[in-house]
């Protein structure tokens, strides 16, 4: 059973990853951001369920496609390199679900915007710290 | 339809600079990224970084990064490669490519004629 | 960087017969969201730059003639040219378009026997 301690860490890096994905999306929807439109061409791939830690496999396995839309971007939209921020993400994400863990992600059918994506993904931070707190 | 075209061959003493230039016509050069690509004699390809010409974002590979950098020139519709501490293993063939479809990672579907530089003292 | 590892470094084949190229990636180059490979295949002549032949493992580039197929998932990729006419003659390069930097194997030269 997880204990308090365990418990305070993973809501910790929760809202770590939560502050992360806010900021990305801040950046992109920042007015100054003249790549938006173009930006909103690319497609990510949602989770069919998100519900649990296991199912931040589903965001690792697109973390790639993020950091190369995210180099598109003026630099000054974030306060760190899209590799430095992605690498950051992916540590936090592979602590939360386990690296030991072997869950094949199931995706939808629909594909999303990378405002859409970012948006499912905040959510589900939202949603998982709402229930340690 | 699509073209790019290179400046012609270059030859640099070592430590110099040199500027590479890649003119695009049947296309809107801000419509797409510009890569640029070199190839030593007898080698392989070698990817060195990509420009979006409309706003003028780049990004390099970390091993050209500080000695490269890539510009771009709207209103001649014309990209430019400029390499400086030329040292002669720099010496290629370096090409400008273009892309299938907007994308940093998609592949490179249009290719100039390339420019060999020369690097000798 | 992901490395490309491509075998053999030349291959000689008679005219008509079949030409298979191998190349390996150092992670895999599968997206699972879409199922898609990010591999493309290039083929360059002398003092010529390379040209495209095929994307996303399996897609043809438009133009290019139906005996070059690709195919392979994951790290495993296989260029086949299904008989070989004398102008394919050529240096073959894999190249992964999966993350930056893209990188390209070594390439593979291709003569007639």
């Known amino acids: 059973a997880p204990t308090s301690s365990s418990t305070k860490k993973t809501q910790l890096q929760l809202e770590h990853l939560l502050l992360d994905l806010q900021m990305i999306l801040n950046g992109i929807n920042n007015y100054k951001n003249p790549k938006l439109t173009r930006m909103l061409t690319f497609k990510f791939y949602m989770p069919k369920k998100a519900t649990e830690l296991k199912h931040l496999q589903c965001l690792e396995e697109e973390l790639k496609p993020l950091e190369e839309v995210l180099n598109l971007a003026q630099s000054k939209n974030f306060h760190l390199r899209p590799r430095d921020l992605i690498s950051n993400i992916n540590v936090i994400v592979l602590e939360l679900k386990g690296s030991e863990t072997t869950f094949m992600c199931e995706y939808a059918d629909e594909t999303a915007t990378i405002v859409e994506f970012l948006n499912r993904w905040i959510t589900f931070c939202q949603s998982i710290i709402s229930t340690l707190t | 339809q699509v073209q790019l075209v290179q400046s012609g061959a270059e030859v640099k003493k070592p430590g110099s600079s040199v500027k590479v230039s890649c003119k695009a016509s049947?296309?809107?050069?801000?419509?797409?990224?510009i890569h640029w690509v070199r190839q030593a004699p007898g080698q392989g390809l070698e990817w060195m970084g990509w420009?979006?010409?409309?706003?003028?974002?780049?990004a390099y590979a970390q091993k050209f990064q500080g000695r490269v950098t890539l510009t771009a020139d709207t209103s001649t519709s014309t990209a430019y490669m400029e390499l400086s501490s030329l040292r002669s293993e720099d010496t290629a063939v370096y090409y400008c490519?273009?892309?299938?479809?907007?994308?940093?990672?998609?592949?490179?579907?249009?290719w100039g004629q390339g420019t060999l530089v020369t690097v000798s003292s | 960087d992901i490395v490309m590892t491509q075998s053999p470094d030349s291959l000689a084949v008679s005219l008509g017969e079949r030409a298979t190229i191998n190349c390996k990636s150092s992670?895999?180059?599968?997206?699972?969201?879409?199922?898609?490979?990010?591999l493309a295949w290039y083929q360059q002549k002398p003092g010529q730059p390379p040209k495209l032949l095929i994307y996303?493992?399996?897609t043809g580039q438009s133009g290019v003639p139906d005996r070059f197929s690709g195919s392979g998932s994951g790290t495993d990729f296989t260029l086949t040219i299904s008989s070989l006419q004398a102008e394919d003659v050529a240096v073959y390069y894999c190249?992964?378009?999966?993350?930056?930097?893209?990188?390209f194997g070594a390439g593979t030269k291709v003569e007639i026997k």
């Open positions: 490519a273009r892309s299938l479809d907007y994308d940093p990672i998609y592949p490179f579907a249009y």
């Open positions: 049947g296309y809107s050069i801000t419509d797409y990224l």
């Open positions: 420009i979006d010409p409309e706003d003028g974002v780049t």
């Open positions: 992670q895999s180059l599968l997206r699972n969201g879409n199922q898609k490979n990010y």
């Open positions: 996303y493992a399996s």
């Open positions: 190249q992964q378009h999966y993350v930056t930097p893209p990188t």
